[in-house]
């Protein structure tokens, strides 16, 4: 009679993470009598996966009923596969012995490859805000995928970016891999509503890539532009001076009025106007009693935005001239106060 052969018909098996792997194995003879064991790997460090004779293997089920006398099918199913299960599995026939069974013959092995989806990409930006025209770095990370081949792209508002570097680790063979990419983005004043998107494509995703996003509103600081203008007079001895604080982001802003370098009033922006591009506008006005000043007055609107050094704009108020000759040098608007300008 021909000697028993252990046949593992599948050289390799590819399974998606979370699914069940079927590892096929048949023997060509019932003799010699003895159990079957499954191992991952070969040599002294091999890992026992299933022992027909004894032990508890909750993830493993047999395809056939191994208790039947004439059974020669020793295929197994391993449930809830993870990338850690990847490796070469050997079906090994043992001969009954005393005191221990003796290894008789091994199958050629089946390599189990696990296809694992990448985790949702996580995009993170710089710790501190940056102003327009500056270049900032964004990182994108995704983990736990297999096989190693993966494609990563960066976009800003739908436009693909080219300035980025990507690494897939580890470089050698592994049960699963991670990707790390850093992209450089130049900020513009219009980026409050912008998004940076990291897109990851992998064989496990069936053409439906995963995306991670970062809102540039968390990264950008748009400094305000200031305009100080003198409005037409309300009364013979009063002049209304307006400070327009335009196109700033984020909202945190404090304004101080100075008269000849002395603090006149400090206020915090509360009722701001949101612009279409996501930036904010704010207006403050100062009513100056011209009769209280003997000399010309230098009025300064000083703004501290988002904890940055103060910026300021000044306006010279000529006290010597009759107040009514002090015209407005720009159009202004009714900002909700009960003050009215002259039509």
């Amino acid at each position: 009679e021909e000697e028993l052969q252990v046949i593992q018909p599948d050289k390799s098996v590819l399974v998606a993470a979370g699914e069940t792997a079927t590892l096929r194995c048949t023997a060509t003879s019932l003799i010699p009598v003895g159990p079957i064991q499954w191992f991952r790997g070969a040599g002294p460090g091999r890992e026992l996966i299933y022992n027909q004779k004894e032990g508890h293997f909750p993830r493993v089920t047999t395809v056939s009923d191994l208790t039947k006398r004439n059974n020669m099918d020793f295929s197994i199913r391993i449930g809830n596969i993870t990338p850690a299960d990847a490796g070469t599995y050997y079906c090994v026939k043992f001969r009954k012995g005393s005191p221990d069974d003796v290894e008789f013959k091994s199958g050629a092995g089946t390599e189990l490859s696990v296809r694992a989806k990448p985790s949702a990409p996580v995009v993170s930006g710089p710790a501190a805000r940056a102003t327009p025209q500056h270049t900032v770095s964004f990182t994108c990370e995704s983990h736990g995928f297999s096989p190693r081949d993966i494609t990563l792209k960066w976009f800003k508002n739908g436009n693909e970016l080219s300035d980025f570097q990507t690494n897939v680790d580890p470089v050698g063979e592994s049960v699963s891999y991670s990707i790390h990419s850093t992209a450089k983005v130049v900020l513009t004043r219009e980026d409050v509503h912008s998004q940076v998107i990291c897109e990851v494509a992998h064989v496990t995703l069936q053409g439906d890539p995963l995306r991670g996003t970062a809102n540039l509103s968390e990264t950008i600081r748009v400094p305000p532009t200031l305009e100080v203008t003198q409005q037409p007079v309300r009364a013979e001895n009063q002049v209304n001076v307006t400070c327009q604080v335009r196109k700033f982001y984020p909202q945190r802003l404090q304004l101080t009025w100075l008269e000849n370098g002395n603090v006149s009033r400090t206020e915090t922006a509360s009722t701001v106007t949101e612009n279409k591009d996501g930036t904010y506008n704010w207006m403050s006005w100062l009513l100056v009693n011209v009769s209280a000043h003997r000399d010309d007055v230098k009025l300064t609107c000083q703004v501290e935005h988002d904890g940055q050094p103060a910026v300021s704009k000044s306006h010279d108020l000529k006290v010597s001239a009759h107040p009514k000759e002090q015209g407005s040098n720009t159009a202004a608007e009714n900002t909700g106060s009960n003050e009215r300008n002259i039509y």
């Epitope: 513009t188 949101e274 612009n275 608007e333």
Partner: antibody, heavy 118, light 112 residues
């Protein structure tokens, strides 16, 4: 005094090109969004194109997309509109307008006339 | 595109009368930031248009309080409580909430 002054209009043949300009003065041009608005011979107003203060955002009316290009030179306080593949329907008075504090059109120029005719 | 429809095309009035101009948008013109960028402009003969009302109901600097704007969603109205000679001209509504921005066809306010 806050003002914008358009120039460069004229008579041009269909299919031809023309570049009109808008010189701004009396305000911090580089911090204002700007648009071009035109008025047809029938006196209808049409918004043509928009450019943000830094030039990073640009939008066009469908009727001019691909043919007109809005641009700005903040160092020269000047707004431009490059018009190509001109059609008779582009005949209009072209106004340069400033987007003010609440993003309305608060400053309008006197306009420059563009006539497209063979 | 958002179509802005103005009515009437022509509005003959007597000085001192109230005038009312309607503007209807083909879709909501509430911007994603919550503001409604509906404006009214007046163009007097031989002049460039001038801003009267912004964000539906706010009078621009120097505009007399006889001008008032109202409305929401898609229906907007400009009212002149007592028409004066200097109010004559063509009134345009305008939406600046969604690109492409669009003007209404205009309403000519003239003496009866």
């Amino acid at each position: 005094e806050v003002q914008v002054v358009e120039s460069g209009g004229g008579l041009v043949k269909p299919g031809g090109s023309l570049k009109i300009s808008c010189a701004a003065s009396g305000f911090a041009f580089s911090s204002y969004d700007m648009s071009w608005v035109r008025q047809t011979p029938e006196k209808r107003l049409e918004w043509v194109a928009y450019i943000s203060s830094g030039g990073g955002s640009i939008y066009y009316a469908e009727t001019v997309k691909g043919r007109f290009t809005i641009s700005r030179d903040n160092a020269k306080n000047t707004l431009y509109l490059q018009m190509s593949s001109l059609k008779s329907e582009d005949t209009a008075m072209y106004y340069c307008v400033r987007h003010g504090y609440h993003e309305y059109f608060d400053v309008w120029g006197a306009g420059t006339t563009v006539t497209v005719s063979s | 595109d958002v179509l802005m429809t103005q009515t009437p095309l022509s509005l003959p009035v007597s000085l001192g009368d109230q005038a009312s101009i309607s503007c209807r948008s083909s879709q909501s013109i509430v911007h994603s930031n919550g503001n409604t960028y509906l404006e009214w402009y007046l163009q007097k003969p031989g002049q460039s248009p001038k801003l009267l009302i912004y964000k539906v109901s706010n009078r621009f600097s120097g505009v007399p309080d006889r001008f008032s704007g109202s409305g929401s969603g898609t229906d907007f109205t400009l009212k002149i409580s007592r028409v004066e000679a200097e109010d004559l001209g063509v009134y345009f509504c305008f939406q600046g909430s969604h690109f492409p921005y669009t003007f209404g066809g205009g309403t000519k306010l003239e003496i009866k």
